[in-house]
């Protein structure tokens, strides 16, 4: 049994880091493998993660961690029974993938403006809370070409767009994802999408 693709890990910079790797053949990850991880710090204890299968030869492990700080560094040991398959380290602050935003809502009753709001996925005491920016994806269910991404570079988890910039009388969907420039993170996963019917009313023409 050998590791084909070494573990790569990302942290949500809160409580979970996720490590993925591939073995050289079909593997029952949960029965055959264990991933041990330990904070490099005086008196810290080792923890064991039981991996799950992620495709035929792929494994994934969700490492539970206490509140992460930028200096944290973990040793990682991948074991198959008594055999050490791989040894490495992981610094969560250098491999951050934020949590996905939630509670995306489209408010269609604000005159002729669409107001999209969502929730910051972090509590106020987490460092990322005040460092997330967002991308909002809006697309038409009728026209595959009509697929837009709005970059929200301010901190407020909301976006206002004129309803008239979208086509009237058809259905749209929206979703949102987050990233943090300060840690050069990857993008989060997309939030669940939400759907609405765009029924923009033309203003009365005055001649």
């Amino acid at each position: 049994m050998k590791v084909l693709q070494e573990p790569t890990c990302v942290s949500d910079y809160m409580s979970i880091s996720t490590c993925e790797w591939k073995m050289n053949g079909p593997t029952n990850c949960s029965t055959e493998l264990r991933l041990l991880y330990q904070l490099v710090f005086l008196l810290s204890e080792a923890h064991t993660c039981i991996p799950e299968n992620n495709g035929g030869a792929g494994c994934v492990c969700h490492l539970l961690m206490d509140d992460v700080v930028s200096a944290d560094n973990y040793t990682l040991d991948l074991w198959a029974g008594q055999q050490l398959l791989w040894k490495g380290s992981f610094k969560p602050s250098e491999h951050v993938k934020p949590r996905a935003p939630g509670n995306l809502t489209v408010h269609t009753n604000v005159s002729d403006t669409l107001l999209l709001t969502w929730s910051n996925p972090y509590p106020p005491d987490n460092y990322l809370y005040n460092h997330l920016t967002y991308a909002v994806n809006i697309w038409s269910e009728n026209d595959p070409a009509d697929f837009r991404i709005y970059n929200v570079t301010y901190l407020e988890p909301s976006l206002r767009i004129a309803a008239s910039t979208l086509k009237s009388g058809i259905s749209y969907r929206a979703r949102v994802r987050a990233w943090a420039q300060c840690y050069n993170t990857t993008w989060s996963e997309w939030s669940p999408s939400t759907k609405w019917h765009n029924s923009y009313r033309e203003p009365f023409e005055q001649h």
Epitope: D143, P144, A145, D146, F147, R148, I149, Y150, A162, S164, T165, L166, K167, S168, Y200, E202
Partner: antibody
Amino acid sequence: QVQLQQSGPGLVKPSQTLSLTCAISGDSVSSNIATWNWIRQSPSRGLECLGRTYYRSKWYSDYAVSVKSRITINPDTSKNQFSLQLNSVTPEDTAVYYCARGWNYGYYFDYWGQGTLVTVSS
Amino acid sequence: EIVMTQSPATLSVSPGERATLSCRASQSVSSNLAWYQQKPGQAPRLLIYGASTRATGIPTRFSGSGSGTEFTLTISSLQSEDFAVYYCQQYNNWPYTFGQGTKLEIK
């Protein structure tokens, strides 16, 4: 900075096929927030959108009704370009042909190629 | 398809004066309308999108207004480089369509 560079012959014989290519730099033909368009301009017809190709987890093409039976627009991801083929041309297809990028918030044309005058004549 | 009609076909204005160009759509295009400037031998250049938003690098003397079927492009104080042909274009419904153009010439 996005740039579109057109290439192809300026003279095509009637009943033959007009072929033009648009090379993209500064963006990707596989972008999911762009469309890649061919537009032509003639004194008789003005500016006319002929068709477009775009990627949204799979490739799509849309064509104007006036040329639908004769036109093909194909992306080439390996060369980051897209092409126009217009079959069975007649002198009425004589025009300046432009490629252009349609962009994100509704797909207006924000970058254009330099234009190619194509004359259909024997 | 949506027919775009521009007026006037030709507009003669003196440098420094204001120019107002009109565009009408045969059916509503919401605010999915763009304006382009074209000079001889050149490709069209995007000026305005979303009926009223200036494209990157476009001077503030260019402004757009309108929604639905009636649109206006205003150039507040004409400079010598502004004399050209101007086109409106709807991108609400495929196929996207252009107006026939307004030629802005020096009076």
